[in-house]
Protein backbone atom coordinates (compact mmCIF):
# COMPACT_ATOMS: atom_id res chain seq x y z
CA UNK A 1 0.00 0.00 0.00
CA UNK A 2 1.26 3.45 -0.91
CA UNK A 3 0.16 7.05 -0.62
CA UNK A 4 -1.77 8.48 -3.53
CA UNK A 5 -1.90 12.00 -4.93
CA UNK A 6 -5.13 13.46 -6.19
CA UNK A 7 -5.25 15.47 -9.40
CA UNK A 8 -6.97 18.80 -9.85
CA UNK A 9 -8.69 18.79 -13.24
CA UNK A 10 -9.66 21.89 -15.18
CA UNK A 11 -11.65 20.73 -18.18
CA UNK A 12 -12.83 22.95 -21.02
CA UNK A 13 -15.59 22.02 -23.41
CA UNK A 14 -15.55 23.96 -26.65
CA UNK A 15 -17.84 23.66 -29.65
CA UNK A 16 -15.50 24.29 -32.61
CA UNK A 17 -15.90 27.42 -34.74
CA UNK A 18 -18.17 29.18 -32.23
CA UNK A 19 -15.71 31.44 -30.43
CA UNK A 20 -14.40 31.70 -26.94
CA UNK A 21 -17.72 32.64 -25.34
CA UNK A 22 -18.95 29.09 -25.88
CA UNK A 23 -16.07 27.61 -23.87
CA UNK A 24 -17.11 26.18 -20.49
CA UNK A 25 -14.49 25.44 -17.83
CA UNK A 26 -15.12 22.87 -15.10
CA UNK A 27 -12.77 22.64 -12.12
CA UNK A 28 -12.73 19.56 -9.89
CA UNK A 29 -10.51 17.24 -7.84
CA UNK A 30 -11.71 14.01 -9.41
CA UNK A 31 -8.54 12.25 -10.52
CA UNK A 32 -5.65 10.37 -8.94
CA UNK A 33 -2.09 10.18 -10.20
CA UNK A 34 -0.70 6.77 -11.03
CA UNK A 35 1.82 5.38 -8.55
CA UNK A 36 4.61 5.49 -11.16
CA UNK A 37 3.56 8.75 -12.81
CA UNK A 38 5.64 11.90 -12.73
CA UNK A 39 4.00 14.22 -10.18
CA UNK A 40 3.77 17.27 -12.41
CA UNK A 41 1.16 19.32 -14.24
CA UNK A 42 0.26 18.67 -17.85
CA UNK A 43 -2.33 19.96 -20.29
CA UNK A 44 -3.68 19.03 -23.67
CA UNK A 45 -6.58 18.16 -25.91
CA UNK A 46 -8.14 14.83 -24.95
CA UNK A 47 -7.97 12.24 -27.75
CA UNK A 48 -9.55 8.77 -27.55
CA UNK A 49 -8.23 5.83 -29.58
CA UNK A 50 -9.47 5.51 -33.16
CA UNK A 51 -12.33 3.12 -33.74
CA UNK A 52 -15.31 2.15 -31.58
CA UNK A 53 -13.73 -1.08 -30.34
CA UNK A 54 -10.40 0.45 -29.41
CA UNK A 55 -11.32 2.34 -26.23
CA UNK A 56 -9.12 0.09 -24.07
CA UNK A 57 -6.07 0.64 -26.31
CA UNK A 58 -4.90 -2.91 -25.72
CA UNK A 59 -4.03 -3.52 -29.37
CA UNK A 60 -0.42 -2.38 -29.88
CA UNK A 61 -1.43 -1.02 -33.30
CA UNK A 62 -4.01 1.34 -31.80
CA UNK A 63 -3.84 4.82 -33.32
CA UNK A 64 -5.02 8.26 -32.23
CA UNK A 65 -6.21 11.04 -34.54
CA UNK A 66 -4.51 14.07 -33.08
CA UNK A 67 -5.65 17.59 -34.02
CA UNK A 68 -3.12 20.00 -35.48
CA UNK A 69 -2.42 23.69 -35.10
CA UNK A 70 -4.57 25.54 -37.65
CA UNK A 71 -2.96 25.74 -41.07
CA UNK A 72 -0.16 23.33 -40.22
CA UNK A 73 0.72 19.69 -39.71
CA UNK A 74 2.06 20.38 -36.20
CA UNK A 75 0.22 18.32 -33.60
CA UNK A 76 -1.17 20.10 -30.56
CA UNK A 77 -0.25 18.91 -27.08
CA UNK A 78 -2.64 16.02 -26.34
CA UNK A 79 -3.66 13.54 -23.70
CA UNK A 80 -4.77 10.00 -24.50
CA UNK A 81 -8.22 9.17 -23.11
CA UNK A 82 -8.29 5.40 -22.54
CA UNK A 83 -10.75 3.10 -20.79
CA UNK A 84 -9.56 0.71 -18.09
CA UNK A 85 -9.68 -3.00 -18.89
CA UNK A 86 -9.67 -4.98 -22.11
CA UNK A 87 -7.04 -7.48 -21.04
CA UNK A 88 -3.95 -5.27 -20.82
CA UNK A 89 -2.24 -3.51 -17.94
CA UNK A 90 -2.19 0.16 -17.06
CA UNK A 91 1.49 0.13 -18.04
CA UNK A 92 0.59 -1.17 -21.52
CA UNK A 93 -1.93 1.62 -22.03
CA UNK A 94 0.33 4.39 -20.76
CA UNK A 95 3.33 3.15 -22.72
CA UNK A 96 1.26 3.06 -25.92
CA UNK A 97 0.12 6.65 -25.31
CA UNK A 98 3.73 7.69 -24.79
CA UNK A 99 4.84 5.93 -27.97
CA UNK A 100 2.13 7.70 -29.96
CA UNK A 101 3.34 11.09 -28.71
CA UNK A 102 0.85 11.92 -25.96
CA UNK A 103 1.85 14.32 -23.20
CA UNK A 104 -0.18 12.31 -20.74
CA UNK A 105 -2.63 9.45 -20.30
CA UNK A 106 -6.07 9.80 -18.75
CA UNK A 107 -7.46 6.38 -17.87
CA UNK A 108 -11.16 6.24 -17.05
CA UNK A 109 -12.61 3.44 -14.94
CA UNK A 110 -14.78 0.48 -15.98
CA UNK A 111 -18.47 0.98 -16.76
CA UNK A 112 -20.57 0.49 -13.64
CA UNK A 113 -18.03 2.01 -11.26
CA UNK A 114 -19.59 5.48 -11.40
CA UNK A 115 -17.02 7.97 -10.05
CA UNK A 116 -14.81 5.47 -8.25
CA UNK A 117 -11.07 5.83 -8.88
CA UNK A 118 -8.18 3.59 -7.84
CA UNK A 119 -4.41 4.06 -7.55
CA UNK A 120 -2.83 2.61 -10.69
CA UNK A 121 0.47 0.80 -10.57
CA UNK A 122 2.28 0.93 -13.91
CA UNK A 123 5.97 0.05 -13.46
CA UNK A 124 8.08 0.82 -16.50
CA UNK A 125 5.59 3.31 -17.95
CA UNK A 126 7.00 6.38 -16.26
CA UNK A 127 7.65 8.82 -19.11
CA UNK A 128 4.37 10.74 -19.11
CA UNK A 129 1.83 11.87 -16.55
CA UNK A 130 -0.87 9.27 -15.98
CA UNK A 131 -4.05 9.75 -13.98
CA UNK A 132 -7.29 7.87 -13.44
CA UNK A 133 -10.72 9.47 -13.51
CA UNK A 134 -14.12 7.97 -12.83
CA UNK A 135 -16.24 6.25 -15.43
CA UNK A 136 -19.00 8.86 -15.37
CA UNK A 137 -16.55 11.68 -15.97
CA UNK A 138 -14.68 9.75 -18.65
CA UNK A 139 -17.83 8.72 -20.45
CA UNK A 140 -19.14 12.28 -20.45
CA UNK A 141 -15.89 13.50 -21.98
CA UNK A 142 -15.82 10.68 -24.53
CA UNK A 143 -19.40 11.32 -25.64
CA UNK A 144 -18.66 15.02 -26.01
CA UNK A 145 -15.66 14.28 -28.22
CA UNK A 146 -17.76 11.90 -30.32
CA UNK A 147 -20.24 14.76 -30.86
CA UNK A 148 -17.48 16.99 -32.20
CA UNK A 149 -16.80 18.98 -29.04
CA UNK A 150 -13.12 19.60 -28.36
CA UNK A 151 -12.27 18.83 -24.74
CA UNK A 152 -9.09 20.16 -23.16
CA UNK A 153 -7.83 19.11 -19.74
CA UNK A 154 -5.36 20.88 -17.48
CA UNK A 155 -4.06 18.49 -14.81
CA UNK A 156 -2.37 19.78 -11.66
CA UNK A 157 -1.03 18.01 -8.61
CA UNK A 158 -3.57 17.91 -5.79
CA UNK A 159 -3.28 16.55 -2.27
CA UNK A 160 -1.56 13.52 -0.77
CA UNK A 161 -3.78 10.76 0.63
CA UNK A 162 -3.24 7.19 1.62
CA UNK A 163 -2.20 4.55 1.91
CA UNK A 164 -4.28 2.74 -0.73
CA UNK A 165 -3.95 -0.71 -2.28
CA UNK A 166 -2.37 -0.67 -5.74
CA UNK A 167 -3.90 -2.14 -8.90
CA UNK A 168 -2.02 -3.12 -12.05
CA UNK A 169 -4.94 -3.40 -14.49
Amino acid sequence: AEAVWTAYLNVSWRVPHTGVNRTVWELSEEGVYGQDSPLEPVAGVLVPPDGPGALNACNPHTNFTVPTVWGSTVQVSWLALIQRGGGCTFADKIHLAYERGASGAVIFNFPGTRNEVIPMSHPGAVDIVAIMIGNLKGTKILQSIQRGIQVTMVIEVGKKHGPWVNHYS
Epitope: R14, H17, T18, V20, A43, V45, V69, W70, V76, Q150
Partner: nanobody, 118 residues
Framework: QVQLQESGGGLVQAGGSLRLSCAAS????????MGWYRQAPGKEREFVAA???????YYADSVKGRFTISRDNAKNTVYLQMNSLKPEDTAVYYC????????????WGQGTQVTVSS
Protein backbone atom coordinates in the same frame (compact mmCIF):
# COMPACT_ATOMS: atom_id res chain seq x y z
CA GLN B 1 -12.89 44.64 -30.74
CA VAL B 2 -9.37 43.23 -30.62
CA GLN B 3 -6.37 45.10 -31.97
CA LEU B 4 -3.07 43.39 -32.70
CA GLN B 5 -0.10 45.67 -33.22
CA GLU B 6 2.96 44.02 -34.75
CA SER B 7 6.40 45.64 -34.75
CA GLY B 8 10.04 44.74 -35.25
CA GLY B 9 10.04 43.91 -38.94
CA GLY B 10 12.56 45.32 -41.36
CA LEU B 11 15.45 44.60 -43.69
CA VAL B 12 18.25 42.34 -42.49
CA GLN B 13 21.13 40.46 -44.08
CA ALA B 14 21.16 36.68 -44.27
CA GLY B 15 22.44 35.22 -41.02
CA GLY B 16 21.13 38.17 -39.04
CA SER B 17 18.46 38.41 -36.37
CA LEU B 18 15.18 40.21 -35.77
CA ARG B 19 12.70 40.23 -32.90
CA LEU B 20 9.05 40.68 -33.72
CA SER B 21 6.54 41.83 -31.11
CA CYS B 22 2.78 41.75 -31.11
CA ALA B 23 0.79 43.65 -28.51
CA ALA B 24 -2.86 42.70 -28.14
CA SER B 25 -5.41 45.16 -26.80
CA UNK B 26 -9.17 45.28 -26.50
CA UNK B 27 -11.15 42.23 -25.40
CA UNK B 28 -8.60 39.58 -24.48
CA UNK B 29 -9.90 36.49 -22.70
CA UNK B 30 -7.55 34.76 -20.29
CA UNK B 31 -6.98 31.51 -22.03
CA UNK B 32 -6.05 32.50 -25.57
CA UNK B 33 -3.15 30.92 -27.38
CA MET B 34 -1.02 33.14 -29.59
CA GLY B 35 1.20 32.61 -32.60
CA TRP B 36 2.80 33.80 -35.81
CA TYR B 37 2.12 33.01 -39.46
CA ARG B 38 3.80 34.37 -42.56
CA GLN B 39 3.00 34.91 -46.21
CA ALA B 40 5.64 35.22 -48.90
CA PRO B 41 4.79 36.87 -52.24
CA GLY B 42 2.73 34.55 -54.40
CA LYS B 43 2.42 31.92 -51.67
CA GLU B 44 -0.21 30.91 -49.15
CA ARG B 45 -0.08 32.02 -45.54
CA GLU B 46 1.81 29.42 -43.51
CA PHE B 47 2.20 28.58 -39.85
CA VAL B 48 5.45 29.66 -38.17
CA ALA B 49 5.07 29.21 -34.41
CA ALA B 50 2.54 29.19 -31.59
CA UNK B 51 2.51 29.21 -27.80
CA UNK B 52 -0.21 28.04 -25.45
CA UNK B 53 -1.16 29.41 -22.05
CA UNK B 54 1.74 27.75 -20.32
CA UNK B 55 5.12 27.05 -21.79
CA UNK B 56 4.24 24.65 -24.59
CA UNK B 57 5.53 25.91 -27.92
CA TYR B 58 4.95 24.71 -31.46
CA TYR B 59 7.15 25.36 -34.51
CA ALA B 60 7.06 24.70 -38.23
CA ASP B 61 9.90 22.40 -39.26
CA SER B 62 11.39 25.13 -41.43
CA VAL B 63 12.08 27.42 -38.44
CA LYS B 64 12.80 24.91 -35.68
CA GLY B 65 16.05 25.69 -33.92
CA ARG B 66 16.25 29.20 -35.42
CA PHE B 67 13.08 30.92 -34.20
CA THR B 68 11.84 31.18 -30.61
CA ILE B 69 8.34 32.22 -29.59
CA SER B 70 7.60 33.60 -26.13
CA ARG B 71 4.87 35.58 -24.41
CA ASP B 72 4.34 38.06 -21.63
CA ASN B 73 0.86 37.47 -20.27
CA ALA B 74 0.94 40.60 -18.13
CA LYS B 75 1.46 42.69 -21.25
CA ASN B 76 -0.72 40.57 -23.59
CA THR B 77 2.31 40.45 -25.87
CA VAL B 78 3.85 37.67 -27.93
CA TYR B 79 7.38 37.75 -29.34
CA LEU B 80 9.18 35.96 -32.14
CA GLN B 81 12.96 35.92 -31.92
CA MET B 82 14.32 35.08 -35.37
CA ASN B 83 17.96 34.07 -35.67
CA SER B 84 20.07 32.77 -38.57
CA LEU B 85 17.64 34.35 -41.02
CA LYS B 86 17.58 33.11 -44.61
CA PRO B 87 16.34 34.81 -47.80
CA GLU B 88 13.45 32.29 -47.84
CA ASP B 89 12.24 33.75 -44.54
CA THR B 90 11.28 36.92 -46.43
CA ALA B 91 7.54 37.44 -45.94
CA VAL B 92 4.87 39.45 -44.22
CA TYR B 93 4.63 38.11 -40.66
CA TYR B 94 1.20 38.06 -39.05
CA CYS B 95 0.46 37.85 -35.35
CA UNK B 96 -2.35 35.44 -34.53
CA UNK B 97 -4.68 35.06 -31.55
CA UNK B 98 -6.53 31.75 -31.27
CA UNK B 99 -9.83 32.64 -29.65
CA UNK B 100 -11.24 29.25 -30.58
CA UNK B 101 -8.30 27.01 -29.70
CA UNK B 102 -5.11 26.17 -31.54
CA UNK B 103 -6.92 23.94 -33.99
CA UNK B 104 -9.25 26.61 -35.34
CA UNK B 105 -8.90 29.72 -37.51
CA UNK B 106 -7.15 32.50 -35.57
CA UNK B 107 -7.71 36.24 -35.57
CA TRP B 108 -4.98 38.00 -37.57
CA GLY B 109 -3.02 41.20 -37.14
CA GLN B 110 -2.19 43.50 -40.05
CA GLY B 111 1.29 42.08 -40.52
CA THR B 112 4.87 43.35 -40.54
CA GLN B 113 7.29 42.98 -43.43
CA VAL B 114 10.51 41.03 -42.95
CA THR B 115 13.03 41.10 -45.79
CA VAL B 116 16.20 39.03 -45.70
CA SER B 117 18.78 39.97 -48.31
CA SER B 118 21.52 37.69 -49.50
Amino acid sequence: QVQLQESGGGLVQAGGSLRLSCAASGYIFYGVHMGWYRQAPGKEREFVAAIDLGTTTYYADSVKGRFTISRDNAKNTVYLQMNSLKPEDTAVYYCAVYFDGLTNLPYWGQGTQVTVSS
